[in-house]
Amino acid sequence: VPRWRQQWSGPGTTKRFPETVLARCVKYTEIHPEMRHVDCQSVWDAFKGAFISKHPCNITEEDYQPLMKLGTQTVPCNKILLWSRIKDLAHQFTQVQRDMFTLEDTLLGYLADDLTWCGEFNTSKINYQSCPDWRKDCSNNPVSVFWKTVSRRFAEAACDVVHVMLNGSRSKIFDKNSTFGSVEVHNLQPEKVQTLEAWVIHGGREDSRDLCQDPTIKELESIISKRNIQFSCKNIYRPDKFLQCVKNPEDSSCTSEI
């Protein structure tokens, strides 16, 4: 008789999850000499220890502390790029602008990017059938708590001018419920961070509106200003040209507004 198992609303653990985490760790530590000391088997053990045998709606930041220790990494605190709802462009940007970093350019972010995982209470099994959905099931699930934990630490480490890329095509350009809006904004340290500069990315080629005047951007400005951090905003009208100009800043067409 098959044992009854909890059916969650979200997709199950990514197939070959253990192998993927281990392989990504090995690849990352080979590419980044400053992380060569990391023992990837310990990283996997720490990752596994954070959620295996635990109820997938009862995960805490504390569960991830061994993994956080192993993944401790120094990135230049003035070269941090946050993003919300526009991950692909943010990653394309840091692939070109190699001295800037998104969370997914760090070891822990790289390990977990686009993956889903959860276990089952009191068993050593990984649940490949379903995992809790943040909205429909519970917010304290393994994936959400992981991203909340690493995002908080990433924001806390930032200094000087912090950049954030926002999606101008969405109804809420700044969304208070996103990881950026609910975690990162509130964990920037006013004693270290001078300015948050938002880059609002336009979707349509003919879109010449000033999206920095959008009510949600004004809301972001208000939140940031109350935290004694300066706020600035730029429209990126042509994201394709923007990336091209990051690659080739000497190009004559790059002096005009992007």
């Epitope: 000391h37 990391v38 053990d45 045998s53």
Partner: antibody
């Protein structure tokens, strides 16, 4: 296999203190949990606690709080355990051992004898 | 504290035999269990972790099994060099605790 080097036997007087070292050649010293384990003849193995050299975080077995103090020096990749107010009950072999999910690397042990 | 009970202080076996050493936890530790071998005058060596994962370099005649409260270390095709003490350890809860050990004797 990385070696954990511990000093030879120690003979100490009651009430005195002793500090045992555990040196490793491991480049991953800072990101390893370093445990200390006590073994008395016929008494099996007792976990004293661990230190994580990367940030100095420690976790002690309540039984050894106030008795053992764990420290680490990242520059020399050396972990230390100081035992204070020694009594005959503290006579034992003390091992350092690396790992958090099973201790995968052990020092050869340091025998501590408390005797006047 | 979680008590790890190894009910057999001694076990006797012959070369080529199969022997199972058991360990019982006083509460559920799921699979957070390691097994160690300690030969006379030596420090312990890790054999098994996460209840059933063999540590690097450990011969495949050593097998770990179990979850929850009952755990077993099985040595198949026992060799004379397997004469040693065997300890289980849980790392599910602090403080980490060890079993009292089982001495394997070769007839």
């Amino acid at each position: 296999q990385v070696q954990l080097q511990q000093p030879g036997p120690e003979l100490v007087k009651p009430v005195a203190s002793v500090k045992i070292s555990c040196k490793t050649s491991d480049y991953a010293f800072s990101s390893s949990w370093m445990n200390w384990v006590k073994q008395r003849p016929g008494k099996g193995l007792e976990w004293i606690g661990w230190i994580y050299p990367g940030d100095g975080d420690t976790n002690y077995n309540g039984k050894f709080k106030g008795k053992a103090t764990l420290t680490a020096d990242k520059s020399s990749s050396t972990a230390y355990m100081q035992l204070s107010s020694l009594t005959s009950e503290d006579s034992a072999v003390y091992f350092c051992a690396r790992g958090r999910w099973g201790m995968d690397n052990w020092g050869q042990g340091t025998s501590v004898t408390v005797s006047s | 504290d979680i008590v790890m009970t190894q009910s057999h202080k001694f076990m006797s076996t012959s070369v080529g035999d199969r022997v199972s050493i058991t360990c019982k936890a006083s509460q559920n530790v799921v699979t957070a269990v390691a097994w160690y071998q300690q030969k006379p005058g030596q420090s312990p060596k890790l054999l098994i972790y996460w209840a059933s994962s063999r540590h690097t370099g450990v011969p495949d005649r050593f097998t770990g099994s179990g979850s929850g409260t009952d755990f077993t270390l099985t040595i198949s095709n026992v060799q004379s060099e397997d004469l040693a003490d065997y300890f289980c350890q849980q790392y599910s809860n602090y403080p980490f605790t060890f079993g009292s050990g089982t001495k394997l004797e070769i007839k």
